[in-house]
């Protein structure tokens, strides 16, 4: 899979991660800081 | 399957404002942004703006500073996109498009007419 | 905000001809550019993204290159049914379409 640095309007979309472009899969995704998860790292757990 | 279902065609007088609404089926727009585009008649294609549902923030292009406002109601996965003080050449059929998750999903596309 | 300048607006071409259509960006988009078919009386369907990736279904005859602030998008050799008019979006920044570029069947 091919992955590249999420472009700069995308700046702030995983709120507690770094954000990736999987480019085969024209998609964002987020890589969660531990304790966080969701799409958007947006949830926190204990 | 994911959906943007768009609300229908709106004809309006000179001054108006018209709210076109964008329904998603299949995924949560909080997960993704939306952003808007229009094309006039015969035109090329024109990003106007775009919302994260999420935090609720937008950015818009300049030109339409003062005359779009862009929201989210997360509860109905719903996106608008209002513009205000419309003229002729507001005339356009106007798209929401999915980014983020996946890149460019585009709804079927709202004609607004504009004309006295 | 960022400008696309496409060219050219419109082409003639033949059949089986190789066709290629330019976007120059006014700063580095750093390759986040995608390009866009649209037919009459449809929504635009996206081609490629992330400058040269090719999106499922789409033919092979289709590609993109580039880097920096100079892109390009080729049909290798055109069919009757790629009639249509292409433009180019910069997604690096917000967003950008360029003007366009109409291809017609000579």
């Known amino acids: 899979v091919s992955i590249t640095k999420c472009n700069s309007d995308m700046n702030g979309y995983c709120l507690h991660g770094q954000c990736i472009y999987l480019v085969d899969m024209s998609q964002n995704y987020c890589r969660c800081e531990v304790g966080y998860t969701g799409v958007r790292c947006e949830h926190f757990y204990l | 399957q994911d959906q943007l279902v768009q609300s229908g065609a709106e004809v309006k007088k000179p001054g108006a404002s018209v709210k076109v609404s964008c329904k998603a089926s299949?995924?949560?727009?909080?997960?993704?942004?939306i952003q808007w585009v229009r094309q006039a008649p015969g035109q090329g294609l024109e990003w106007m703006g775009r919302?994260?549902?999420?935090?609720?923030?937008?950015k818009r292009r300049e030109k339409f500073e003062g005359r779009v406002t862009i929201t989210a109601d997360t509860s109905t996965n719903t996106a608008y996109m209002e513009l205000s003080s419309l003229r002729s050449e507001d005339t356009a059929v106007y798209y929401c498009?999915?980014?983020?998750?996946?890149?460019?999903?585009w709804g079927q596309g709202t004609l607004v007419t504009v004309s006295s | 905000d960022i400008q696309m300048t496409q060219s050219p607006s419109s082409l003639s071409a033949s059949v089986g001809d190789r066709v290629t259509i330019t976007c120059k960006a006014s700063?580095?988009?750093?390759?986040?550019i995608a390009w866009y078919q649209q037919k009459p009386g449809q929504a635009p369907r996206l081609l490629i993204q992330?400058?040269?990736t090719l999106q499922p279904g789409v033919p092979s005859r289709f590609s993109g290159s580039g880097s920096g602030t100079d892109y390009t998008f080729t049909i290798s050799s055109l069919q009757p049914e790629d009639i249509a008019t292409y433009y180019c979006?910069?997604?690096?920044?917000?967003?950008?379409f360029g003007g366009g570029t109409k291809v017609e069947i000579k």
């Open positions: 498009v999915r980014s983020g998750t996946l890149f460019d999903f």
């Open positions: 979006l910069q997604y690096d920044n917000l967003r950008t």
């Open positions: 299949g995924f949560n727009i909080k997960d993704t942004y």
């Open positions: 919302i994260d549902p999420l935090r609720g923030n937008t």
């Open positions: 992330y400058t040269s």
């Open positions: 700063q580095d988009i750093h390759k986040y």
